[in-house]
Every structure is written in structure tokens, then in C-alpha cells.
């Protein structure tokens, strides 16, 4: 059988500074069993950008309903997007673990850059 | 439709064992998580045990003593059970899990369940 | 671990009558609740996801409801098939899934 992969289909997203920025995820498997995490940034000092377990994030919504069932869809979208938020994304799928989860695989990245708004 | 179907049930002896299987149909096995839970006679429910892909969960109650496996060419679940004890007397089912909140699992699918019984 | 409260044991009505009972979780699990059905001899039939979302092919009668640590399944006008037992089911941390201990519902 297939492994599962983290498919990050846009290598690269333009914003204007106050809209939303839409960063597309789908995984290809709903197994091995865990959650998925949104981060800017890799290694030890990346941000959690968004976590539907644990955490508030108050700009950031969820494409896809949460109680779908059997969703394969990670995408998110960022409110009132500044500057400040440019940088990599990266969904990343982790496998459930007693008692923290293990990270399993990350998909390729994100790059959202900011356009200043025209004054 | 989907359908689950345990066997392998029966009476035993304590420090005995006995192997369970679930044979699935009606859906895409290998893409699911798939469960035991059992039922003690007259009691309420308890999970036993849950697998993934390679990745296996245990109640504490049986750590060490079950080992939860999957052939996908078979759509088979088993559930291989090592130096029972009378309190693992019950019926237990074989379920399929489904996913909600990008996490989180519930079972939307349920076997019929094979009794196990551990006496003396 | 999460433990899961049913309360009453057991729930005496007459059919076509109106039953509300209640699942207390010692922690927050959010929405991450499942109720389950079981009438004798049967294996559980999934209910309700979600605390509040009906599976395919549940009657309208029943619903769910609450969030956090509180949740109640209600069944409006009982049918003689709704008299079982329910179990309520949290899945937002585990291992393990934990369970209630279960609500009979019996005919008054």
C-alpha cells in the first residue's frame, strides 16, 4: 500500500497586505492515525501557526468543515495578512503517539509573500 | 455495505491464548484505522486496542499481552491474545473507525462480536 | 485519562415520551464526542459525531447537543426500538478512547 504523502500543491502565494491568504494541504491517506499541524518555518524554532486541537488562532480558519467526515483536506486561510507574516508554511502530519505525537512527514512548503498595499 | 465479521471466539484457559479475526467488506480496509473494544457480560463498553497503518495503540489493561494486527490482502484485523485472565471475559468487537476534527476517531461500524470466555 | 460520567443509570419512560440524558467529561474535549446505541443482544449502532452531528440514516427524533465537558442526547418521542442502553464515547485525547459507563433506557 501507498505512504501516506502531504501534498502541498502551491509552491508559492501572493498577498496583498490585509487580505487572506489561502494555503492549500490534502493528505492521501487517513492512516497512519494522528493529527496535522500548520507551522511557518522548520526546525526547533518554527512557529505553530495552527493546531484544531489545542491553542486559540484567531485569524486562521479551516477550508474544509471539522466535522466532515473522513477529511483529507488540511487547507487553511489567514486573516488580515501584514508583512510580518511572510515566510514558508508547511502542513505536517503527525503520528499519534502516548504521550506526544511524532512528527511523520511534512509536505513541501509554502512561501507567502506579502505585496505592501498600495498607498 | 459494509460488514465486519469476528471469529475465532471460545473458552479458555487462564494463561491461554486465542487469536481473533475480523474479516471486512464493503469498503477500502487498507485506508481505515480499524479497532477492538469488548464488553464484559453485563458491563459497559471498553476499547482494547486500534491500528493504523504500522502504527498500533493499546489499552493499558492489555499492553504487553495483545498484539493488534492487519493483512490488507485479506481485509483480516486480528487480535492475537497472550496469557489471558478471567477479566478478559467478554464479547468483543471488531470496529471501523472514522475520522472527524483532523484527528480524532469514532466507530461508525461495528461487528457482531465473538465471545471470549477465561475459566478454569 | 478522560473519565466520561453517564448520568442517570438508569431512565424509566413511557413510549412516545420525551428522554434527556447527560455525559460529563472530567476534561474539555471540545465537540469530540460520540453516542452510541445498544439494544440487547445487538452490537452499538453509532448515533451521533461530533456532539451534535447524526449519522446517515438516524432518525430525526434524536439529537445531541453541548460542548466541553457537557453533553446530552435527547430522544423526542421514544419508539419501543429506542429502549437500550447509550454509551457516550470521547475522542479528543487518547489513547485510550474512553467510554461512559452507559443510561438504560427501560419502559416505564
Known amino acids: 500500500e501507498e505512504e501516506l504523502q502531504v501534498i502541498q500543491p502551491d509552491k508559492s502565494v501572493l498577498v496583498a497586505a490585509g487580505e487572506t491568504a489561502t494555503l492549500r494541504c490534502t493528505a492521501t491517506s487517513l492512516i497512519p492515525v494522528g493529527p496535522i499541524q500548520w507551522f511557518r518555518g522548520a526546525g526547533p524554532g518554527r512557529e505553530l501557526i495552527y493546531n484544531q486541537k489545542e491553542g486559540h488562532f484567531p485569524r486562521v480558519t479551516t477550508v474544509s468543515d471539522l466535522t466532515k467526515r473522513n477529511n483529507m483536506d488540511f487547507s487553511i486561510r489567514i486573516g488580515a495578512i501584514t508583512p510580518a507574516d511572510a515566510g514558508t508554511y508547511y502542513c505536517v502530519k503527525f503520528r499519534k503517539g502516548s504521550p506526544d505525537d511524532v512528527e511523520f512527514k511534512s509536505g513541501a512548503g509554502t512561501e507567502l509573500s506579502v505585496r505592501a498595499k498600495p498607498s | 455495505d459494509v460488514q465486519l465479521l469476528e471469529s475465532g471466539g471460545g473458552v479458555v484457559q487462564p494463561g491461554g491464548s486465542l487469536r481473533l479475526s475480523c474479516a471486512a467488506s464493503?469498503?477500502?480496509?487498507?485506508?481505515?484505522?480499524m479497532t477492538w473494544v469488548r464488553q464484559a457480560p453485563g458491563e459497559g463498553l471498553e476499547w482494547v486496542s486500534t491500528i493504523g497503518s504500522g502504527d498500533t495503540y493499546y489499552a493499558d489493561s492489555v499492553k504487553g499481552r495483545f498484539t493488534i494486527s492487519r493483512d490488507n490482502s485479506k481485509n483480516t484485523l486480528y487480535l492475537q491474545m497472550n496469557s489471558l485472565r478471567a477479566e478478559d471475559t467478554a464479547v468483543y468487537y471488531c470496529a471501523k473507525d472514522s475520522t472527524v476534527s483532523w484527528s480524532g476517531d469514532f466507530f461508525d461500524y461495528w461487528g457482531l462480536g465473538t465471545l471470549v470466555t477465561v475459566s478454569s | 485519562e478522560i473519565v466520561l460520567t453517564q448520568s442517570p443509570a438508569t431512565l424509566s419512560v413511557s413510549p412516545g415520551e420525551r428522554a434527556t440524558f447527560s455525559c460529563r467529561a472530567s476534561q474539555n474535549v471540545k465537540n469530540d464526542l460520540a453516542w452510541y446505541q445498544q439494544r440487547p443482544g445487538q452490537a452499538p449502532r453509532l448515533l451521533i459525531y461530533a456532539a451534535r452531528i447524526r449519522e446517515t440514516g438516524i432518525p430525526e427524533r434524536f439529537s445531541g447537543s453541548g460542548s466541553g465537558t457537557e453533553f446530552t442526547l435527547t430522544i423526542t418521542s421514544l419508539q419501543s426500538e429506542d429502549f437500550a442502553v447509550y454509551y457516550c464515547?470521547?475522542?479528543?485525547?487518547?489513547?485510550?478512547?474512553?467510554f461512559g459507563g452507559g443510561t438504560k433506557v427501560e419502559i416505564k
Open positions: 464493503g469498503f477500502s480496509f487498507s485506508n481505515f484505522a
Open positions: 464515547q470521547q475522542y479528543y485525547d487518547w489513547p485510550p478512547f474512553t
